[in-house]
Interface confidence: low
């Protein structure tokens, strides 16, 4: 089981207007025609990706400004894995297989990407962080 949904961020957060009008299962949040799960426990990047895939999702693929702002606000001060990783000798890739095209700056020099409200950065993949899954609406 992925675990119960919660918002570990430190700020009060008003739900986006379309969050409650969705086709997402219990414990998932709908936004911009995607369903999101925000974990309440910490895992490594690979373990988090596996947890997402058990539910037909991937670690979050971020492909719009709205998605990015939504996730940063949800993450708050806590670091959350998202679905961007770099294998040696390869470009950054999203967990859906798409190559990353550098539309935002990833700080740090590690292989796995996390976000929080103030930054998108990289960290050693074995570190245990919260994580965010997403998948399209049914």
């Amino acid at each position: 089981s992925v675990g119960q949904y919660n918002c570990p961020g430190q700020y009060t957060f008003s739900m986006p207007s379309d969050s409650h009008v969705s086709s997402c299962s219990e414990d998932w949040v709908g936004y911009q025609r995607k369903c999101y799960f925000i974990s309440t426990v910490k895992r490594s990047w690979t373990s988090a990706q596996n947890a997402c895939s058990e539910h037909g999702a991937t670690l979050a693929v971020i492909d719009s400004e709205k998605d990015m702002n939504f996730l940063k606000r949800y993450a708050g001060r806590e670091e959350h894995w998202v679905g961007l990783k770099k294998e040696p000798g390869h470009p950054w890739k999203w967990s859906n297989g798409k190559e990353f095209n550098n539309w935002f700056n990833v700080t740090g020099s590690d292989k796995c990407v996390f976000l929080k409200n103030t930054e998108v950065s990289s960290m050693e993949c074995e570190k245990n962080l919260y994580w965010i899954c997403n998948k399209p609406y049914k």
């Epitope: 297989g97 190559e99 990353f100 539309w103």
Partner: antibody, heavy 106, light 108 residues
């Protein structure tokens, strides 16, 4: 401008936080398609160039003036084109300048 | 570097569906963007991230991308859709932008 000459293009931006955005130059020769020329990160720490202009063109920006520049040296006839500056936002060019025609001819 | 190939021209009757292809090696592993350009004007993005429409772009514009081919589809084509269309992608290692050669869409 004559072949071998130099020219500096500028692009003044407004309405957004200029320093937060990667900016690009894209050109279009008369009757031809779009050709990417160069890009620069928000802090100017990274710059990239098309092979066709590398070593001749230099992209720069002044965030205090919200202005993007393209210094073009050793100009050739094949550099004749409309040059557009464009904002790169979530991997597409969402705002473009109106374009400026550069003609290289003797 | 990736090269993007588009047909030089596509013709369609008003109200019919126009499809413009863009092919490149393993293009499906990258995001593709589509721009519309009318004479004397700067390009306008009509599809980003393979299949997403910016606000203000009519629903008749849609996109897909898999394998080696991306496709821009215009359903119920209107006279005002007559323009040049360019696909765009990128090279991940060098952050270089690549455009297709452009397709002139004629609405008969």
């Amino acid at each position: 401008v004559q072949p071998g000459g130099s020219l500096r293009l500028s692009c003044a931006a407004s309405g957004f936080t200029f320093s937060n955005f990667v900016m690009h130059w894209v050109r279009q020769a008369p009757g031809k398609g779009l050709e990417w020329v160069s890009s620069i990160s928000g802090s100017s720490s990274s710059t990239y160039y098309a092979d066709s202009v590398k070593g001749r063109f230099t992209i720069s920006r002044d965030n205090s003036k919200n202005t993007l520049y393209l210094q073009m040296n050793s100009l050739r006839a094949e550099d004749t084109a409309v040059y557009y500056c464009a904002r790169y936002y979530y991997a597409s060019f969402d705002y473009w300048g109106q374009g400026t025609l550069v003609t290289v001819s003797s | 570097d990736i090269e993007l190939t588009q047909p030089p021209s596509v013709s369609v009757a008003p109200g019919q569906t126009a499809r413009i292809s863009c092919s490149g090696d393993s293009l499906g592993s990258k995001y593709v963007y589509w721009y519309q350009q009318k004479p004397g004007q700067a390009p306008v993005v009509v599809i980003y991230g393979d299949s997403k429409r910016p606000s203000g772009i009519p629903e008749r514009f849609s996109g897909s991308n898999s394998g080696n081919t991306a496709t821009l589809t215009i359903s119920g084509t209107q006279a005002e859709d007559e323009a040049d269309y360019y696909c765009q992608s990128y090279t991940s290692f060098t952050t270089k932008i690549v455009f297709g050669g452009g397709t002139k869409l004629t609405v008969l």
